[in-house]
């Protein structure tokens, strides 16, 4: 009978562009926060977070690997990528004093999910969540959540960058996380 | 010809680890907010929300069932789980008075998506969104959104817990919701 | 041998309700922000954003089309729909003055993902993220993220509406976006 085509199983009006494949073998990862070791980074470059990839709720599967702050994309396709970073800080000084120290610029918190392609020198920012912080209480905390779909190529690398690594809440795996899965 | 193997439809370099299955029959649910009935709960235990599961935009399908505040997982696998809770409140009293009532602790709002396994009494917190509230206006409102992928087992139950059920905006189905789908 | 049934590839205990189909041919779109042209809209009706659909990170594929602020759904099924809108504004005047201008109502920002069905005159609000704004600094900015799963029909149209189009941050494709994909 020869090699059967995937589209023989689809209704006649429906075009099938790719071979059928099992959902269970798709690359997937959910990474959770760990205590960050302060690293040197350039002034206007946000530092990347590193992650837990196999303890607790964290996992990588089906050739999706985590290494040195990067999720490695093992297969080209459309991926849903998401992250939440919970920030926390102290603002005991009055906002007037703080503003004086940083004129015309409110304090802010930012998360960026970045794609790095070895063949291309400049990273690509896929997602950004950025928020001004004008809390009046002495302790403040809040999450920034991001998630969207992107077409990625085999060999692409994903990382999460933040504006200030010292403000990231690393106390609980459910507060700060990063994940991706092939659709 | 005998039973055909799923991998006959995959390119030769690609391994198929699980049987092919139709997307349309995967367990899925999107639940929407209803007016909450105040329930007794322990001091340090966040109350669970209950949900609409079949009216308006809400639905459950393919053996994903909703019962008594819980989404029941009918099949082991990787699920994307999400929820948004919109909170609203009044802060007519000055923040000084409020802070005095709760010394050293800012008011906050928290959402937790929790997994319960019958064989084990202690719930596992999958996702948490928590935010300090330091609004100065008389009326404030804001959403907390959560979403991520988790490996769940058949029989697991999911619920959404909040720090204060009386602050949840139950007025519209598009403001406060909870869902999950098998990937 | 005739047409083979998709369920021949599933284990015997498993019911398959729909024909198998390749993931790669599913309708998908990720749209990114562009500068908005101010449009006339009715007083209590939120204006719709228009989007980039093919440059940079934006794409539409597999019969998912974008036209005139709408994403067109080409095939019935369950879709995950998401959007983030980053708002930014100035609040140089004191909150007392601002409150006086809008008595009993704090300033707010709102995003709505709306479904329009040609056969039905009234749009359906699928998702809403709404937040009071009580920033005390002179410049403020913050994102609202939304995402959930909905059952859509072929021919449905999706759009993103906002409370004030002039507050939308259109400067970067990673800050404000809109997407949907068939599950």
């Amino acid at each position: 009978m020869g090699a059967l085509k995937g589209q023989e199983f689809a209704p006649s009006h429906q075009q099938v562009y790719a071979p059928l494949r099992a959902d269970g073998d798709k690359p997937r990862a959910h990474l959770t926060v760990v205590r960050q070791t302060p690293t040197q980074h350039f002034k206007n470059q946000f530092p990347a977070l590193h992650w837990e990839h196999e303890l607790g709720l964290a996992f990588t599967k089906n050739r999706m690997n985590y290494t040195n702050k990067f999720l490695l994309i093992p297969e080209s396709g459309d991926y849903f990528i998401y992250s939440q970073v919970t920030f926390r800080g102290m603002t005991s000084e009055s906002s007037e004093i703080r503003q004086a120290g940083r004129p015309n610029k409110p304090d802010s918190i930012t998360v960026v999910i970045t794609k790095v392609t070895d063949s291309y020198p400049e990273p690509t920012q896929l997602l950004m969540g950025t928020k001004s912080v004008s809390e009046v209480g002495s302790n403040w905390f809040q999450p920034i959540y991001l998630g969207a779909m992107f077409s990625l190529q085999e060999g692409d690398k994903l990382m999460v960058n933040v504006s200030d690594i010292s403000l990231v809440d690393y106390t609980k795996e459910d507060k700060t996380f990063f994940g991706a899965f092939l659709l | 010809m005998g039973a055909l193997k799923g991998q006959e439809f995959a390119p030769s370099h690609q391994q198929v680890y699980a049987p092919l299955r139709a997307d349309g029959d995967k367990p899925r649910a999107h639940l929407t907010v209803v007016r909450q009935t105040p329930t007794q709960h322990f001091k340090n235990q966040f109350p669970a929300l209950h949900w609409e599961h079949e009216l308006g935009l809400a639905f459950t399908k393919n053996r994903m069932n909703y019962t008594n505040k819980f989404l029941l997982i009918p099949e082991s696998g990787d699920y994307f789980i999400y929820s948004q809770v919109t909170f609203r409140g009044m802060t007519s009293e000055s923040s000084e008075i409020r802070q005095a009532g709760r010394p050293n602790k800012p008011d906050s709002i928290t959402v937790v998506i929790t997994k319960v396994t019958d064989s084990y009494p202690e719930p596992t917190q999958l996702l948490m969104g928590t935010k300090s509230v330091s609004e100065v206006g008389s009326n404030w409102f804001q959403p907390i959104y959560l979403g991520a992928m988790f490996s769940l087992q058949e029989g697991d139950k999911l619920m959404v817990n909040v720090s204060d059920i009386s602050l949840v905006d139950y007025t519209k189905e598009d403001k406060t919701f909870f869902g999950a789908f098998l990937l | 041998m005739g047409a083979l049934k998709g369920q021949e590839f599933a284990p015997s205990h498993q019911q398959v309700y729909a024909p198998l189909r390749a993931d790669g041919d599913k309708p998908r779109a990720h749209l990114t922000v562009v500068r908005q042209t101010p449009t006339q809209h009715f007083k209590n009706q939120f204006p719709a954003l228009h989007w980039e659909h093919e440059l940079g990170l934006a794409f539409t594929k597999n019969r998912m089309n974008y036209t005139n602020k709408f994403l067109l759904i080409p095939e019935s099924g369950d879709y995950f729909i998401y959007s983030q809108v980053t708002f930014r504004g100035m609040t140089s005047e004191s909150s007392e003055i601002r409150q006086a201008g809008r008595p009993n109502k704090p300033d707010s920002i709102t995003v709505v993902i709306t479904k329009v069905t040609d056969s039905y005159p009234e749009p359906t609000q699928l998702l809403m993220g709404t937040k009071s704004v009580s920033e005390v600094g002179s410049n403020w900015f913050q994102p609202i993220y939304l995402g959930a799963m909905f059952s859509l029909q072929e021919g449905d149209k999706l759009m993103v509406n906002v409370s004030d189009i002039s507050l939308v941050d259109y400067t970067k494709e990673d800050k404000t976006f809109f997407g949907a994909f068939l599950l």
Partner: antibody, heavy 124, light 107 residues
Framework: EVQLVESGGGLVQPGGSLRLSCAAS????????ISWVRQAPGKGLEWVAW????????HYARMLQGRFTISRDNAKNSLYLQMNSLRAEDTAVYYC?????????????????WGQGTTVTVSS | EIVMTQSPATLSLSPGERATLSCRAS??????LAWYQQKPGQAPRLLIY???NRATGIPARFSGSGSGTDFTLTISSLQPEDFAVYYC?????????FGQGTKVEIK
């Protein structure tokens, strides 16, 4: 009560195989990883292998990789250690131990629950 | 792999005395170190995790300290039931590795 119970130990000839089992109860089996640890007579503790019951990831002691295989059955709350090509130096008490993870990025935890051990003797 | 070295091999002390056990890693393990106690014929018991945190039900006389490569387990006042073998274990890198143990015996 949180409990781990090993079984499957016994006398086996060199080159033979044995499959150890560890039955868990009283906790969420899928959340905590489990390790096998062994102790030869009069010797110290030696870590053998680890599995994430949540996602199936595994790690092995370098000297044992290839001969030993760790696996789990979440439906049965059970863990297994398949030991092949056994040698005299594999003679030991084999413990399964739960790897507590406190759900915090600040901690890596430790093995907080241990079984009573099962004895494996490799001898001709 | 990371090699863990414990010293001394044996510590002879009397009840009520202070015991100080040392554990050194061949490379940094951050604070990812656990201490276990084992009595003859019994399974080990977790005492300390992440270098300085007492496990559930462990008396306050047990304390841990250190980070990087040098760690210490201190028993402030030895009780009769504390005479046993103590093991350290690094949990920073696979494979997990144990020290060879320190035996605390009655003098």
């Amino acid at each position: 009560e949180v409990q781990l119970v090993e079984s499957g130990g016994g006398l086996v000839q060199p080159g033979g195989s044995l499959r150890l089992s560890c039955a868990a109860s009283g906790y969420d089996f899928t959340y905590y990883g489990i390790s096998w640890v062994r102790q030869a007579p009069g010797k110290g503790l030696e870590w053998v292998a680890w599995i994430s019951t949540y996602n199936g990831n595994t790690h092995y002691a370098r000297m044992l990789q290839g001969r030993f295989t760790i696996s789990r059955d979440n439906a049965k709350n059970s863990l297994y250690l398949q030991m092949n090509s056994l040698r005299a130096e594999d003679t030991a008490v084999y413990y399964c131990a739960r790897e507590n993870y406190y759900g915090s990025g600040a901690y890596r935890g430790g093995m907080d629950v241990w079984g009573q051990g099962t004895t494996v003797t490799v001898s001709s | 792999e990371i090699v863990m070295t414990q010293s001394p091999a044996t510590l002879s002390l009397s009840p009520g005395e202070r015991a100080t056990l040392s554990c050194r890693a061949s490379q940094s393990v951050s604070s990812y170190l656990a201490w276990y106690q084992q009595k003859p014929g019994q399974a080990p018991r977790l005492l300390i995790y992440d270098a300085s945190n007492r496990a559930t039900g462990i008396p306050a006389r047990f304390s841990g300290s250190g980070s990087g490569t040098d760690f210490t387990l201190t028993i402030s006042s030895l009780q009769p039931e504390d005479f046993a073998v103590y093991y350290c274990q690094q949990r920073s890198n696979w494979p997990w590795t144990f020290g060879q143990g320190t035996k605390v015996e009655i003098k």
